[in-house]
């Protein structure tokens, strides 16, 4: 058993049929010694008396808010949560496996630049009685500071018969140099509590590996005289690290119709303009990627050909 | 400790091309190592990230773009002294800071070159003959060093009398390649910045 935060404790249980469970001793936070009784949740049934209560925690019915009272007055609370371990593996029931970039990916993180700011998000089908807490650091043995905000519900989607909820959090490394060469990864730890179930999820990454620039901005087309070709130009996104001559991007320019199966014109360039063949009912799209370290491509920025 | 904006003309900056070749060569070599050593811990997640130049050179700090010198987090520099007479400088106006930056890059290359050559000698003794260093990568390191053209004492190639542990050597190769790729990215950024300034 360990303390998650003040008056909230996590009991780690090996979860299998007829498991013996864990013996837990609760102590009432009071100078009083006599006349103390214990109850669980809203029940008035007295579970025991005395300054300490010993319980055998085996299942979710044994978890919850234990309260010690004296003469009708509440003295203190202890909330017990369960963390299940099945076949030596901690349960991951609360969050959905996003399966990208690999299986057992529960947390996904992205950074728009090298400033040390990044966003992580996760998915769940649970809509109520759900709380998250996020901590982060650079390295684990001698951790350096990363400050994370509160996790918020950022999107709701319908997937078949299920509703899916996306939560996200923004974090900022306390003293980040965009030009630094990372040797210690960022660690992100998410505590998830659904009702009386506790789970924790972690992700470890280098900012350089989670870079995904914003799409190029200000796409403009200039038809070339006596030709089917157009010159398309664009600019670096505002959120990209500066100076751009140091933090350079490379671009992919594509002309395509509405369907992905349609034929296309595609060209890669390090410049902020390119010449392509425009077709009726097609769009010109441009996306960006770090020129020197191939992490993710940005989303497409698009303009219609006509 | 930073790069001033007054730097050589783009046409006078021969190192950019070499640095692009360097990044390409080390990336290819790393990819090859990951594929060949698939049963060894050779991915970025599996290895310890070590920097053999730590406390010996200060390339990131010495080559910091002017725009980032206002960022205090970028300025915890390690003091190191360097020889300053490179041919990539190509201009009388080139500042001491830029010379310091380029000589730091030169020292990096020299240290990695020695490590890679020592390692290759060991790998050539491996009866499995599983992996060797790409001669193209070694040649590209050499070309960029020649383009930088700094005079410095030659570092003797480390020789070892004991029987090499090939498993450890291959893991060390992965560690070195990952670190060198990161440094090659920095070098490419620096050269691009200098070329544009």
């Amino acid at each position: 058993i360990w303390e998650l935060k003040k008056d909230v404790y996590v009991v780690e249980l090996d979860w299998y049929p007829d498991a013996p469970g864990e013996m837990v001793v609760l102590t009432c936070d009071t100078p009083e010694e006599d006349g103390i009784t214990w109850t669980l949740d809203q029940s008035s049934e007295v579970l025991g008396s005395g300054k300490t209560l010993t319980i055998q925690v085996k299942e979710f019915g044994d978890a919850g808010q234990y309260t010690c009272h004296k003469g009708g007055e509440v003295l203190s609370h202890s909330l017990l949560l369960l963390h299940k371990k099945e076949d030596g593996i901690w349960s991951t029931d609360i969050l959905k496996d996003q399966k990208e970039p690999k299986n057992k990916t529960f947390l996904r993180c992205e950074a728009k630049n090298y400033s040390g700011r990044f966003t992580c998000w996760w998915l769940t089908t649970i809509s109520t009685d759900l709380t998250f807490s996020v901590k982060s650091s650079r390295g684990s043995s001698d951790p350096q500071g990363v400050t994370c905000g509160a996790a918020t519900l950022s999107a709701e989607r319908v997937r078949g018969d299920n509703k899916e909820y996306e939560y996200s959090v923004e974090c900022q490394e306390d003293s980040a140099c965009p030009a630094a060469e990372e040797s210690l990864p960022i660690e992100v730890m998410v505590d998830a509590v659904h009702k009386l179930k506790y789970e924790n999820y972690t992700s470890s990454f280098f900012i350089r590996d989670i870079i995904k620039p914003d799409p190029p901005k200000n796409l403009q087309l200039k038809p070339l005289k006596n030709s089917r070709q157009v010159e398309v130009s664009w600019e670096y996104p505002d959120t990209w690290s500066t100076p751009h001559s140091y933090f350079s991007l490379t671009f992919c320019v594509q002309v395509q119709g509405k369907s992905k199966r349609e034929k296309k014109d595609r060209v890669f360039t390090d410049k902020t303009s390119a010449t392509v063949i425009c077709r009726k009912n097609a769009s010109i799209s441009v996306r960006a990627q770090d020129r020197y370290y191939s992490s993710s491509w940005s989303e497409w920025a698009s303009v219609p050909c006509s | 400790r930073n790069l001033p904006v007054a730097t050589p003309d783009p046409g006078m900056f021969p190192c950019l091309h070499h640095s692009q070749n360097l990044l390409r060569a080390v990336s290819n070599m790393l990819q090859k190592a990951r594929q060949t050593l698939e049963f060894y811990p050779c991915t970025s997640e599996e290895i310890d990230h070590e920097d053999i130049t730590k406390d010996k050179t200060s390339t990131v700090e010495a080559c910091l773009p002017l725009e980032l010198t206002k960022n205090e987090s970028c300025l915890n520099s390690r003091e190191t002294s360097f020889i300053t007479n490179g041919s990539c400088l190509a201009s009388r106006k080139t500042s001491f800071m830029m010379a310091l930056c380029l000589s730091s890059i030169y020292e990096d290359l020299k240290m990695y070159q020695v490590e890679f050559k020592t390692m290759n000698a060991k790998l050539l003794m491996d009866p499995k003959r599983q992996i060797f260093l790409d001669q193209n990568m070694l040649a590209v390191i050499d070309e960029l060093m020649q383009a930088l053209n700094f005079n410095s004492e030659t570092v003797p190639q480390k020789s070892s009398l004991e029987e090499p542990d090939f498993y450890k050597t291959k893991i060390k190769l992965c560690i070195l390649l990952h670190a060198f790729r990161i440094r090659a990215v920095t070098i490419d950024r620096v050269m691009s910045y200098l070329n544009a300034s």
Epitope: T250, R261, D265, F268, R279 | -
Partner: antibody, heavy 118, light 107 residues
């Protein structure tokens, strides 16, 4: 299986024209760009131009501009390349090629040898 | 027009050994470079797209690298069926242009 089948070998006199056909099968004809590339005996490859069969748009290499015409007939899934004012240097194997991507080729025809000789 | 220069023009290789062919562009073409293989009496066949993207059905011993002006096609271990002529082609701008070809011959 995508296939491009070209017309047979031709022998032509200098100054005349030649029209080579390329019939596509497998996949929708208008879903692909069609190119013509030639190869003189013992020489390398030379791109001549492309057509978008969907709308008849064409682009020719400056070297062949005014001398080459590429057309397409959607009803028969056939592309044509006509080269006029033939000279002996036009003796070559002419390949049609196609791809959903405009600027390179994933399938080429078997080639048509055009010999220009007096 | 962008001029593509291949080297060497002839490459004698022992079967089972690796082979590398170089292709240089007269100006920077990013990764807009494609490789083809041509056997005598046959049409060219696509091997690599955009400098390094492998093509389905092409053996994994063929790999490409490079960007900007310098590109390489590598065959990790030459098989008897790999003795052929190899061409690079740029798609950065029209007109599309090819290298002169590199003939890989049995040593």
């Amino acid at each position: 299986q995508v296939q491009l089948v070209q017309s047979g070998a031709e022998v032509k006199k200098p100054g005349s024209s030649v029209k080579v056909s390329c019939k596509a099968s497998g996949g929708t004809f208008s879903d692909y760009y069609l190119h013509w590339v030639r190869q003189a005996p013992g020489q390398g490859l030379e791109w001549m131009g492309w057509i978008d069969p969907e709308n008849g748009d064409t682009e020719y290499a400056p070297k062949f501009q005014g001398r080459v015409t590429i057309t397409a007939d959607e009803s028969t899934s056939t592309a044509y390349m006509e080269l006029s004012s033939l000279r002996s240097e036009d003796t070559a194997v002419y390949y049609c090629a196609r791809n959903k991507e405009l600027r390179y080729f994933d399938v080429l025809g078997q080639g048509t040898l055009v010999t220009v000789s007096s | 027009d962008i001029v593509m220069t291949q080297s060497p023009l002839s490459l004698p290789v022992t079967p089972g050994e690796p082979a590398s062919i170089s292709c240089r562009a007269s100006q920077s073409i990013s990764i807009n470079l494609h490789w083809y293989q041509q056997k005598p009496g046959q049409a060219p066949r696509q091997l690599i797209a955009f400098a390094s993207q492998s093509i389905s059905g092409v053996p994994s011993r063929f790999s490409g690298s490079g960007s900007g002006t310098d590109f390489t096609l590598t065959i990790s271990s030459l098989q008897p069926e790999d003795f052929a002529t190899y061409y690079c082609q740029q798609s950065n701008s029209f007109p599309l242009t090819f290298g002169q070809g590199t003939k890989v011959e049995i040593k």
